[in-house]
Interface confidence: medium
């Protein structure tokens, strides 16, 4: 591989790597504008820091330290910065691959678990705000009522509920969009850890080519 | 053509369960609501709630909470409502009916006649 | 819970003549999308319940011309022009407006 094929080598990584950094600013800046103008409340008691907010944030931080890694890396040929940037990456892959056997495998569990943590969050309505706000956003935004329908309000149920006559539960219609989109979800989440693959690879073929061009020139 | 299929009768002691059926045939099953309907020996009909089987979403009659729990078998194409902690006041015939979407209960099973009984 | 009352609670009726049954909501069944959600039903002896008629008005397929729905809001009755042995039975008109679902009482219709 010649001085080119390193040069364009490593110009995709910066250019690609700039994309998503911009993209981690992007979902970041969400992520805190929704923990400032906070609508959306708790919706499990028992994991009060699992807010929309708090996700995107997470999700926008990760993906730009990253992203600067590997532009950073790339443009100024560091090799340990390559590395710490092929090492995260490794990591979220690995992480995300367990996750999805998890989620596969106790996909029966997981679903009790909600059930159970939405139905606590249903009691907790009338007398907590944020419990309240996170229904409220849930049911209008969705167009649903309750976990799995009008019964699960014991007192009736609220205002946000929408007056369709034949209303569907909000975590019944969920499972049902995933279940109906899984194909698609199976797509994006395996084009994602394409893009990660072809990110280490990337990383690593650039590692290796700055060695040999050390090598070359004498270094 | 849409037929609703429901067993003839059970006779249970007080204070047991029962699971009726409701098996559904000549349509797509997961498309339609599926009603449950009440009727006491020479009274009137009671609504107890219906059930949509694709998602699972159930919307009940408040009156039947705690008492009845509705449920759907896609693959068998079956709807099943649950009757717990029986009385004599349970004595009744029960109905599955199909939901139009657009309106109301436009085809009608036979009925199941519960007996809670000692 | 909306109360649907109806009246009369029985009614004996000769062969050809007309029958009128009333249905009175104790609050409006205009629904949000400009539909009223009455429906009137048929049980004959020993039978499963029949919808005769729906949206208020709406015949379903099958069900004799002679049978007619009307009203709007909360007042609606079903008219059987020219009554037949046939029609023996009680018939119960439902609510869909509002959970939970609710009957009226229901009319028993016997032929003199």
């Known amino acids: 591989m010649g001085m080119s094929s390193l040069k364009l080598l490593k110009y995709v990584l910066f250019f690609f790597n700039l994309l998503f950094w911009i993209c981690g600013c992007c979902i970041l800046g969400f992520g805190i504008y929704l923990l400032i103008h906070n609508n959306f409340g708790v919706l499990f008691h028992n994991l009060p820091s699992l807010t929309l907010g708090n996700v995107f944030v997470i999700v926008g931080s990760i993906i730009m330290v990253v992203a600067f890694l590997g532009c950073m890396g790339s443009i100024k040929e560091n090799k340990c910065l390559l590395m710490s940037f092929f090492i995260l990456l490794l990591i979220i892959l690995l992480a995300e691959v367990t996750l999805a056997i998890l989620l596969f495998v106790y996909e029966q569990k997981l679903n009790e678990y909600v059930a159970k943590g939405l139905t606590d969050s249903i009691h907790r309505y009338h007398s907590d705000n944020s419990t309240k706000a996170a229904w409220d956003s849930i049911q209008s935004f969705l167009q649903c009522c309750g976990i799995n329908g009008t019964s699960d309000w014991t007192s009736g149920p609220p205002a946000s509920c929408p007056s369709d006559r034949k209303v569907e539960g909000c975590y019944a219609k969920a499972r049902l969009w995933f279940h109906s989109n899984f194909l698609y979800i199976g797509i994006i989440t395996i084009c994602v850890c394409v893009i990660e693959v072809l990110g280490m690879s990337f990383a690593l073929t650039l590692n290796c080519q700055i060695d040999k061009t050390s090598q070359t020139i004498g270094l | 053509q849409v037929q609703l299929q429901q067993p003839g009768a059970e006779l249970v002691k007080p204070g047991a369960s029962v699971k009726l059926s409701c098996k559904a045939s000549g349509y797509t099953f997961t498309s339609y609501w599926m009603h449950w309907v009440k009727q006491r020996p020479g009274q009137g009909l009671e609504w107890i709630g219906m059930?949509?089987?694709?998602?699972?979403?159930?919307n009940h009659n408040g009156k039947f909470r705690g008492k009845a729990t509705l449920t759907v078998d896609k693959s068998s194409s079956t709807a099943y409502i649950q009757l717990s902690s029986l009385t004599s006041e349970d004595s009744a015939v029960y109905y599955c009916?199909?939901?139009?979407?657009?309106?109301?209960?436009?085809?009608w099973g036979q009925g199941t006649s519960v007996t809670v009984s000692s | 819970d909306v109360v649907m009352t109806q009246t009369p609670l029985s009614l004996s009726i000769t062969i050809g003549q007309p029958a009128s049954i009333s249905c009175k909501s104790s609050?409006?069944?205009?629904?949000?999308?400009?539909?009223?959600?009455l429906n009137w039903f048929q049980q004959r002896p020993g039978q499963s319940p029949k919808r005769l008629m729906y949206q208020v008005s709406k015949l379903d397929p099958g069900i004799p011309d002679r049978f007619s729905g009307s009203g709007s809001e909360t007042d609606f009755t079903l008219k059987i022009s020219r009554v037949e042995a046939e029609d023996l039975g009680v018939y119960y008109c439902?609510?869909?407006?509002?959970?939970?679902?609710?009957f009226g009482g229901g009319t028993k219709l016997e032929i003199k």
């Open positions: 059930i949509h089987p694709n998602s699972g979403s159930s």
């Open positions: 439902l609510q869909g407006t509002y959970y939970p679902w609710t």
């Open positions: 609050q409006s069944l205009l629904y949000s999308d400009g539909k009223t959600y």
């Open positions: 009916a199909r939901d139009d979407y657009a309106e109301t209960m436009d085809y």
